[in-house]
Interface confidence: low
Amino acid sequence: CKAMHVAQPAVVLASSRGIASFVCEYASPGKATEVRVTVLRQADSQVTEVCAATYMMGNELTFLDDSICTGTSSGNQVNLTIQGLRAMDTGLYICKVELMYPPPYYLGIGNGTQIYVIDPEPCPDSDF
C-alpha cells in the first residue's frame, strides 16, 4: 500500500436546504483507471462511512441510488455533494481515495472538511 496526498477544503457551510458540496483532489502518481472514493464522518471520536463509490475513470461517478451523496469526476478531482443534512449532521467529513487499478494500490486520506449545518428557521406563518 502506497500513500497518496488528498486535498479537500477545511470548511464548508451547507445550504439552507441541507446540501453541502466540496472538491476532493488527489495527487495521482500514475494513470489510475479504477478509483474508489469514500466519505467518512468523524464526530465525537467516532468514524462512520457516509457513502462510497467505485468508478472507472472517464465514466460517471455512481453511488448506489439511495445514497445521500452524488458526485462527478474530472481528472484527479471528485466533486462531491452530500444531501439531506441537518444540524445534527455537523461534523468533519473526510475524503478517502483508493486507486484500485492498475497496481500498485494507493491510499490517500484527506484532513477532512468541517461541514456546518444550520437548520433553517421555520416561516412564522407556516405549519411545517
Epitope: E34, M56, D65, D66
Partner: antibody
C-alpha cells in the same frame, strides 16, 4: 462495435460445476463493470453478481455467495462466472451484461442441470 | 432485499393503443430502470434513472414515478413492442428485477 460473446450451451449433472465465459470486444474492457444475470425457463431475471475487470473487485447476491465465483482474464478481455454444486433449479440461461445500466448484453448461455 | 412487484402480469392490447404498466418496490428507491425482452432474445435497456430514454429507444416509451411506485408507458403500440418488460432497481444490493409484465396482442 461493442460485443459480448458468451460460450455455448452446457449440460451438467447435479453436484457438478459450470464455468460460463463472456468475451468482450469493441471497448476498453477495464472501463466497465460486468454483471451476471440468470433467467430460469419461463421466469424473470435474477442478478448473480458483478466484477470490476480492472481490479477484480466483486459484489455478489447473497443467494449465490459461496457457490458463484466471478473472475476475469484481462489479457483476453473475458469474464467468467463459475457456479458450483449445481442442482436442477440452476437450469437457466446465464447472461453477462456491461455495467452501464445494462446497455449491452451477451446472447446468453443455456445451462441445463439434469441427471 | 428490495422486492419489485409488477402489474399487471399480462397486458392484452392492440397496436395503436396506449400501454401502461406499473412496478411497486417494497422499500422506497431513488430510480427505476426498465428492460424489454422479446422471446429468445437478451434483454434490451429501455429506460434508466426512472425517465431517461436509452440510446436508440423510440420516443413513444416513457417512464415516471418516485418513491415506491413507478410506471412505464408506451404511447401508441407498434407490433414490435409486444414483449415482456422488466423493472430493475440498483438502489441497494442485491440488485433486483420485477417478475415481468407480458404485453400481448389482443
Amino acid at each position: 462495435q461493442v460485443q459480448l460473446v458468451q460460450s455455448g450451451a452446457e449440460l451438467k449433472k447435479p453436484g457438478a460445476s459450470v464455468k460460463v465465459s463472456c468475451k468482450a470486444s469493441g471497448y476498453t474492457f477495464t472501463s466497465y463493470w460486468i454483471n451476471w444475470i440468470r433467467q430460469a425457463p419461463g421466469q424473470g431475471l435474477e442478478w448473480i453478481g458483478r466484477i470490476a475487470p480492472g481490479s477484480g473487485t466483486t459484489y455478489y447476491n447473497e443467494v449465490f455467495k459461496g457457490r458463484a465465483t466471478i473472475t476475469v482474464d484481462k489479457s483476453t478481455s473475458t469474464a467468467y462466472m463459475e457456479l458450483s454444486s449445481l442442482r436442477s433449479e440452476d437450469t437457466a440461461v446465464y447472461f453477462c451484461a456491461r455495467g452501464d445500466y445494462g446497455s449491452y448484453w451477451g446472447q446468453g448461455t443455456l445451462v441445463t442441470v439434469s441427471s | 432485499e428490495i422486492v419489485l412487484t409488477q402489474s399487471p402480469a399480462t397486458l392484452s392490447l392492440s397496436p395503436g393503443e396506449r400501454a401502461t404498466m406499473s412496478c411497486s418496490a417494497s422499500s422506497s428507491i431513488s430510480y427505476m430502470h426498465w428492460f424489454q425482452q422479446r422471446p429468445g432474445q437478451s434483454p434490451r435497456r429501455l429506460i434508466y434513472d426512472t425517465s431517461k430514454l436509452a440510446s436508440g429507444v423510440p420516443a413513444r416509451f416513457s417512464g415516471s414515478g418516485s418513491g415506491t411506485d413507478y410506471t412505464l408507458t408506451i404511447s401508441s403500440l407498434e407490433p414490435e413492442d409486444f414483449a415482456t418488460y422488466y423493472c430493475h432497481q440498483r438502489t441497494s444490493y442485491p440488485l433486483t428485477f420485477g417478475q415481468g409484465t407480458k404485453l400481448e396482442i389482443k
